[in-house]
């Protein structure tokens, strides 16, 4: 019961985590910036992994996608890659874990197979969570270092003059969503791995069996298997306990040369 609960909870936590990673990846508020020196109106800039937006105090909002793939900073490309890998691994992990859930019966799937699938999905969730945390942390580091806005400088560009205005970017909501989501996915993965240990079948322990001859006509074969030509009803060598067989729980047995334990 505890194993089923741990597995189920791990699945739900991971599901929430992966949904959060997807949300964070799609969000535009990875970095935010307020412009207080705007002579016209309060303008609020924010950027995501895919596009840049501006929102005015009037409520007007405009977003534009990043114009090129090759011109983007390597760090931004790395963050995108980490987040996408995290989502893909998480999605596969969810798919695997659905079939691994103990409460869901699919055909004659053995517990050992479910245990392996639970472990696989758990590892996938852990890696997915780590990818998300790493991606968000790399982006946060980019904002903290703020390498492209260290000074305000003016230079002549094509067709006129360009001035880089010193600006400060702060952490956007998506970073916090990503950190929390990555953490949840990681925790869910750990829970799945813990559940896997409980699902894995122990070594099969047969109860000790004592055999007592009930009559002279009964022939015993070593190993407790009934003699078979291969054409009878016992082709799979199933253990046969006849009338004389009793488990040690049922009768007190005494040693004899016919005892096989």
């Amino acid at each position: 019961m505890a194993v089923t609960a741990c597995q189920g909870l791990g699945f739900v936590v991971s599901l929430i985590g992966i949904a959060g990673i997807i949300a964070a990846t799609c969000m535009d508020q990875w970095s935010t910036q307020d412009l207080y020196n705007n002579p016209v109106t309060a303008v609020f800039n924010y950027q995501g992994l895919w596009r840049s937006c501006v929102r005015e105090s009037s409520g007007f909002t405009e977003c534009r996608g990043y114009f090129t793939l090759l011109g983007l900073p390597a760090m931004l490309q790395a963050v995108r890659a980490l987040m996408i890998v995290g989502i893909v691994l998480g999605a596969i992990g969810l798919l695997v874990s659905i079939f691994a859930l103990k409460c869901i019966r699919i055909g004659s799937m053995e517990d050992s197979a479910k245990a392996n699938m639970t472990l696989t999905s758990g590892i996938m969730f852990i890696v997915s969570g780590l990818c998300a945390i790493a991606g968000v942390s790399v982006f946060a580091n980019m904002l903290v270092t703020n390498f492209w806005m260290s000074t305000a400088n003016m230079y002549t560009g094509m067709g006129g003059m360009v001035q880089t205005v010193q600006t400060r970017y702060t952490f956007g909501a998506a970073l916090f969503v990503g950190w929390v989501a990555g953490g949840l996915t990681l925790i869910g993965g750990v829970m799945m791995c813990i559940a896997c240990r409980g699902l894995a079948p122990e070594e099969t322990n047969y109860k000790a069996v004592s055999y007592h001859a009930s009559g002279h006509s009964v022939a015993y074969k070593p190993g407790g298997f009934k003699a078979s030509t291969g054409f009878g009803s016992n082709t799979k060598n199933k253990k046969i306990y006849d009338g004389g067989a009793r488990t040690e729980d049922e009768v007190q047995s005494y040693p004899s040369k016919h005892d096989y334990v």
């Epitope: 910036q33 950027q47 840049s52 983007l72 900073p73 931004l76 806005m149």
Partner: nanobody, 121 residues
Framework: EVQLVESGGGLVQPGGSLRLSCAAS????????MGWYRQAPGKERELVAT???????NYQGNLKGRFIISGDNTKDTVYLQMNNLQPEDTAVYYC???????????????WGQGTQVTVSS
């Protein structure tokens, strides 16, 4: 790179009108606002008018009423309709864009090369 191309300047008689236009092209992301500055001979550059993408406008005090700023968001173009021009309006008019590149390069102010407006009889 962002390029600003201005047009519409020229010689006009006092009381006349001119319409300046400025089109931005290139890798443009979030335009915070666009507008016009002017610089008369021997004077400092001064703000004429600015407009945000949402249409909020700001004019230099005594110009409101005579000058009308407008923008076309789809074309990334800003216009300045100048009416009842006076000799003191003679200056080089510079188109202006403030563009936010965010994580790709911060906040940048762009000025065009300028277009000459001369008000004379």
């Amino acid at each position: 790179e962002v390029q600003l191309v201005e047009s519409g300047g020229g010689l006009v008689q006092p009381g006349g009108s001119l319409r300046l236009s400025c089109a931005a092209s290139g890798n443009i992301l979030s335009i915070n606002y666009m507008g016009w500055y002017r610089q008369a001979p021997g004077k400092e550059r001064e703000l004429v008018a600015t407009i945000t993408r949402g249409g909020s406008t700001n004019y230099q005090g005594n110009l409101k009423g005579r000058f009308i700023i407008s923008g076309d968001n789809t074309k990334d173009t800003v216009y300045l309709q100048m009416n009842n021009l006076q000799p003191e309006d003679t200056a080089v008019y510079y188109c202006y864009f403030r563009i936010n590149f965010g994580i790709l390069g911060g906040l940048r102010d762009y000025w065009g090369q300028g277009t000459q407006v001369t008000v004379s009889s």
